[in-house]
Structures are given as structure tokens and as C-alpha cells.
Amino acid sequence: IFPLAFFIYVPMNEQIVIGRLDEDIILPSSFERGSEVVIHWKYQDSYKVHSYYKGSDHLESQDPRYANRTSLFYNEIQNGNASLFFRRVSLLDEGIYTCYVGTAIQVITNKVVLKVGVFLTPVMKYEKRNTNSFLICSVLSVYPRPIITWKMDNTPISENNMEETGSLDSFSINSPLNITGSNSSYECTIENSLLKQTWTGRWTMKDGLHKMQSEHVSLSCQPVNDYFSPNQDFKVTWSRMKSGTFSVLAYYLSSSQNTIINESRFSWNKELINQSDFSMNLMDLNLSDSGEYLCNISSDEYTLLTIHTVHVEPSQETASHN
């Protein structure tokens, strides 16, 4: 009945509704049907959210912050539904809402606790700072404060730096990890306990590849089954790091099954893509192709990063000419 939020039932006519920032929610309230229905919704027992009586809304004294954001299920009132449809919730809307419902038979009051969460999709970034390599897990906007955990080769790491900036309504969080010289795999998990939402970033360094000029190289990129769900929208990006910055070679969008290729020597195997294998080929290698290649598979729930280091060496032919 109430698809826009989930409720936790607690005693004393009190329910908890969990909403997501900027989304619509429903504050539930029901009553025993009767004639002459009066419905008053209030916030923190002080601010008028919505009033309905004598068959229509009376919003003259509605608090301005709720203007054009509330409505009732008017066709359902006679069936005992006094629920409030609440548009575009913000973190300032968190708190206790009281629904007063009166009929000719009885008066009841229901309390609904609204909690609002934010979880803008996090990202895992791989950065080079001078001679150091860093993995950074970051989330631009999150509320309440999330739980961030790191693992190295599936073993939890206690060291966990968190750079936090708080805005008016949410946190922005960066958690960097120095992985200089490491060949281990790393995993970062960000959990929003309120929204019961978890995001995972996984980073894997593949063995270095040595290739000769003019040869081609195949770089593997296959998602880990634990995270990957082909039914969920995701994006695959291949990029190459040159002098500390990545340039995108190609990307694939699962929603449209579109592949965009920015490098003419890059090729993707369509059949492999259909089997969720995003390995790529780079033809006709030249010396400037040496560097780090990053495959990024990202969805709302995970980011899988795979790093390949490619060394292109001059062919014998080229060396003898020199």
C-alpha cells in the first residue's frame, strides 16, 4: 500500500518511517471509519503540516515550509485512510509527526517518526600523488554518518583515515588509503545503516605485462560474481593513466548497451560483453602506450577497479635502426 518508504512498527501508536532526501514519502495513519472526519497533521506538536475537515483541506495556517508539499488520499479518507503524502523530504523534515483524526465516533492520535537518509552513490578513485599511489573511497553526500571499512586481501584494516566535511544537511566523506608498492587487492565498504544500503569498492592489481612495440595486448576485466548483478544498470570504463591523469579510452553503458570508443586501436568483443566479460584489446602498441590501464565497473552498489600495468618495449627491429 505504501511503496515510497518503509515503516518499522513500534509500540504506543508510533511508527518509524524512513525516507530518502528529495524523494516523496507517505506518513501512514489509519482510523476506524466514521462520519464528519477531521484530520490534523502536526510536526513536533507545534507546526501545522496539514488540516482537513468539513470535506476539504484547510491550509490557511499551514506552516510555510510545507506549502505545496502535502496532500491526503482524498478518495480513501472515507475508508479510514488518513495517511499524508509528503513531497521532496529534506533533512530538516526529520522529527515526530502527530496525526489527529476525529470522527463522530472517536478521536485518535497517531505518532509517526520520520527519519531521512542520504546516500549519493559513492566512488572509488585511484590516484597517484608524486611517487605515492592512493585509493580513495568517497561519498559526496551522506546522512547519517556512514560506517567505512577497508580490507586488504579480505582482511580488515584498522587504519582508516576519514576526511569529513559537514554541510547544512549532510556529510561529504573521503577515506584515502596509501597503497604504494602493494600488489594486494583492496576493498572499501560504505554502509548507511539508516537506509540499510551498502556500497562496495574493490581494487585489484593485475600482474604487469611486457609487450613489444607493434604487438597487441589483451587486458582482462571480469566482474566478481559476489557484487555483480547483470540486471542492475552499470557502466564500464577503460582508461589509461598518463602523467598522473586518466584519459578515457572507451566506455559501455548497460542500460542502452552502447559502447563508445575514443581510441581507434581499442577493441571490445561484443560476444564477451554479452557474457559480462569486459576484457579489451589494444592493437599496434607503441612506446607511449606504456602505463597503467584501469577498468572501472560501477553501479549504484559497487565499483570494481582492475589495474593493469603495461610495459611496451622497442622491438628488435626498432632497436637495431637506432
Epitope: E36, H40, Y53, K54, G102, A104, V107
Partner: antibody, heavy 120, light 107 residues
Framework: QVQLVESGGGVVQPGRSLRLSCAAS????????MHWVRQVPGKGLEWVAV????????DYADSVKGRFTISRDNSKNTLYLQMNSLRVEDTAVYYC?????????????WGQGTLVTVSS | DIQMTQSPSSLSASVGDRVTITCRAS??????LAWYQQKPGKVPKLLIY???TLQSGVPSRFSGSGSGTDFTLTISSLQPEDVATYYC?????????FGPGTKVDIK
Amino acid sequence: QVQLVESGGGVVQPGRSLRLSCAASGFTFSNYGMHWVRQVPGKGLEWVAVIWYDGSEKDYADSVKGRFTISRDNSKNTLYLQMNSLRVEDTAVYYCAKDLISGIYYVDHWGQGTLVTVSS
Amino acid sequence: DIQMTQSPSSLSASVGDRVTITCRASQGISNYLAWYQQKPGKVPKLLIYAASTLQSGVPSRFSGSGSGTDFTLTISSLQPEDVATYYCQKYQSAPFTFGPGTKVDIK
């Protein structure tokens, strides 16, 4: 059962003030709107004022607007009517009455009334 | 403000008679009308609300009808205990005015 007991009536000179109280019991006072209605003995009913269950809305008859103030203390289950600048024509029995539902404005229970006489 | 009038101002009828009292609003008030009965020396009692809904515990010989500006209270078979003054009240918007009353007694 619902009980409403008015007090504070008496004889007062024109221009003076009086405060009526109404002690409520037998129902959840904080859930209901409350009214004051008056009646000159032997005459008809005149609605005076109403206050919502939470005190957030009040309305008055034109004849008392600006002179009378309705209020309530839900923690004490008590309704009040502060009457200032009393006039001879305010002489009446003042009934405290309970709304059937807050926001509908008709009355399902009445107190026994308290007599206010304004006379010089 | 909306004015309420009642007619007749008084009436006498025999036990068992059908009695009709009318209430008129100077402007439309939908069905936001209540009827009260006040017996001599007693406080008023709610009989009908929403123009036609009988308050619980009120005998079924009382009925109400009407909408807009014209309303009727009917006692289908007058009983001795119905001797009283009957008031209509509009509750569509403030002020929640009462009609002047109709006094009913037994011939």
C-alpha cells in the same frame, strides 16, 4: 462520563474583568475543541468562542471580539474565558461545552453553566 | 455574517402529532447544521448533526433534512418529554450562530 464544571461567575461592574474556568473530566481533554456559549435567562443561546484541541486556532463572536480571550491548559484539563471591559449586555449564564470533534464546531456535551451578572 | 432564522417561534401540538420546525440560513451552509433540544431548566442536548445524522442515544422519532439554506427538524410522533425549546446552529464557518429557537409544548 464527560463532566464539565464551570466556575468564576458572579456580579461585576461594567468595565471590569472576570475570568471563567471550566474543569473537564471523563474524556481526553487534549483531543477536543472547546466552546463557550452563553444564554440570557429565558432567552436563546449565543455562541461566544471556540478553541481547538491544541489551542492553535481560536474564533470569537463579533459581540465579544477584542474583549474576551479563550484559552486552555491541557495539562490541567481546564478551559478559560478571560472577559475584559464587561458590559451590561454580557449578563448571561456561561456554558462551557465540548466539541464533538475539533474542527467541526458543534457541541455534544455541556456544563451546568455559571451566571455572570454585569451591573452597576 | 450568515443569519439563522427559525419558524415558528413557538407551537403547541397534541401527543402523537407530527411536528415540523424549519431553520433558514441567509446564505448556503451545505449540510453544516446541528439541532439541539433544551428542556426547561436543563442544559442543551445535541439531537442531530450534519443536517440529518442522528446523535447516538437520540430517539428515532427525531429526524433532520435539508441542505444549503433550508433545513427541517421533524418529530414524527410528539411525546410529553419532547416539551422543550429547539435550536438550530450553523457550523460551516465562524461565527457558529444559533437560531433564535422554537418553543414546543403540548396542547
